[in-house]
């Protein structure tokens, strides 16, 4: 059953899926100025057995430019540095994570591909926040959300998590501001909600992010 | 709760422009696919092209490249989709839809072509 | 484009009976179809997705099933406001396309 819509969004932190449930969904968008190979299929699919998970079809992008080929554009190094942080891919997934059973793990990158990504999540999926450069975490509970069932409907669970700028004067739990709603935040703070292909250290990912910061798109 | 409301009717002249709103309210708006979709009297279901706010990515059926536009206003959590050099048989009605599998739906916006 | 061919187009059933529509595509979409019930004056309603996924809220009495190009959809223990017309949809390749549409009455 898939997820009826996305993780909560938590001011200034990120959210990611250490692995995928099989049945996860993945887009196969491409940037501008690109396009899916004609007889591809518009999605990524995490499928297997009780053994092996693996993700069904590959994306591939082709220049819009191109009618009836599939050569791969190289890209500028703009472009190379829009999608730096899709494109790491770290040493420190955790070995329970990535080798449960049913689980996919995040796909390689693919040429060309749009700089975020959109997942459709099942239920069951977890993914874990951690907050974003200049930021930091007051717990009070797990940094996580399960995407569960209940009475028929499809929910997340909400993170135990709020990340305070290092400058600011603390805010300590039960001192939690009302938060926004995401359309309502300025747009410099919708774009905080950075994703990368696994989580970084915390120095690695602050490195990271003062060259690029987008979202890794989930739906 | 997911809900897309959309526009009301319009009457336009061919060769016109006519630009219909959906609004969104519930999730977030800007991982949203947004579709749009039409059916002309007596007619089918006919897919027109989508956008994808937070990529800023349309994609349009062939038969509307060149005359159909798709917009999105994440501070308005707002799609928009613009038909150009109006004609009688663009006469419809036409709904907006969320995600591939078009899982919510508006309530319709009927656009009358008449001189 | 992936061309969607729906069957019948239209059919009359019994209160209580069983009803069965076809679409068949142009090409394998690996399962990447949805069915639709329609109603004048509304809009569309998702009944399932991915072949076989019933959305929450909808009845049992609902179902789906297929692969690669030949997809059947069923209405069992037919009820008066199960008519509509319903429409499959393709979506596994981005120009999405739609079936004809079946009309359903009952008798």
């Known amino acids: 059953e898939l997820c009826d819509d996305d993780p909560p969004e938590i001011p200034h932190a990120t959210f990611k899926a250490m692995a995928y449930k099989e049945g996860t969904m993945l887009n196969c968008e491409c940037k501008r100025g690109f396009r899916r190979i004609k007889s591809g299929s518009l999605y990524m699919l995490c499928t297997g057995n009780s053994s092996h998970s693996s993700w069904d079809n590959q994306c591939q992008c082709t220049s819009s430019a191109t009618r009836n080929t599939t050569k791969q554009v190289t890209p500028q190094p703009e472009e190379q540095k829009e999608r730096k942080t899709t494109e790491m891919q770290s040493p420190m997934q955790p070995v329970d994570q990535a080798s449960l059973p049913g689980h996919c793990r995040e796909p390689p990158p693919w040429e060309n591909e749009a700089t975020e990504r959109i997942y459709h999540f099942v239920v069951g999926q977890m993914v874990y926040y951690q907050c974003v450069q200049g930021y930091r975490a007051l717990h009070r509970g797990p940094a996580e959300s399960v995407c569960k069932m209940t009475h028929g409907k499809t929910r997340w669970t909400q993170p135990q998590l709020i990340c305070t700028g290092e400058m600011e004067t603390s805010q300590f739990p039960g001192e939690e501001k009302p938060q926004a709603s995401p359309e309502g935040r300025p747009e410099s703070e919708t774009s905080c909600l950075v994703t990368t292909t696994d989580f970084q250290i915390q120095t690695e990912m602050a490195a990271t992010m003062e060259t690029s910061i987008f979202t890794t798109e989930y739906q | 709760q997911v809900q897309l409301v959309q526009s009301g009717a319009e009457v336009k002249k061919p060769g016109s422009s006519v630009k219909v709103s959906c609004k969104a309210s519930?999730?977030?708006?800007?991982?949203?696919?947004i579709n749009w979709v039409r059916q002309a009297p007596g007619q089918g279901l006919e897919w027109m092209g989508r956008?994808?706010?937070?990529?800023?990515?349309?994609n349009y059926a062939q038969k509307f490249q060149g005359r159909v536009t798709i917009t999105a206003d994440k501070s308005t959590s707002t799609a928009y989709m613009e038909l150009s050099s109006l004609r009688s048989e663009d006469t419809a009605v036409y709904y907006c839809?969320?995600?591939?599998?078009?899982?919510?739906w508006g309530q319709g916006t009927l656009v009358t072509v008449s001189s | 484009d992936i061309q969607m061919t729906q069957s019948p187009s239209s059919l009359s059933a019994s209160l209580g009976g069983k009803v069965t529509i076809a679409c068949k595509a142009s090409?394998?979409?690996?399962?990447?179809i949805a069915w639709y019930q329609h109603k004048p004056g509304k809009g569309p309603r998702l009944l399932i997705h991915?072949?076989?996924t019933l959305q929450p809220g909808i009845p049992s009495r609902f179902s789906g099933s297929g692969s690669g190009r030949d997809y059947s959809f069923s209405i069992s223990n037919l009820e008066p406001e199960d008519i509509a017309t319903y429409y499959c949809?393709?979506?596994?390749?981005?120009?999405?396309?739609f079936g004809g549409g079946t009309k359903l009455e009952i008798k």
């Open positions: 839809a969320r995600k591939d599998w078009f899982d919510y």
């Open positions: 519930g999730g977030t708006f800007s991982r949203y696919i």
């Open positions: 956008i994808i706010p937070i990529l800023g990515v349309e």
């Open positions: 090409q394998d979409i690996n399962n990447y």
């Open positions: 991915y072949t076989s």
């Open positions: 949809l393709q979506y596994d390749n981005l120009l999405f396309t």
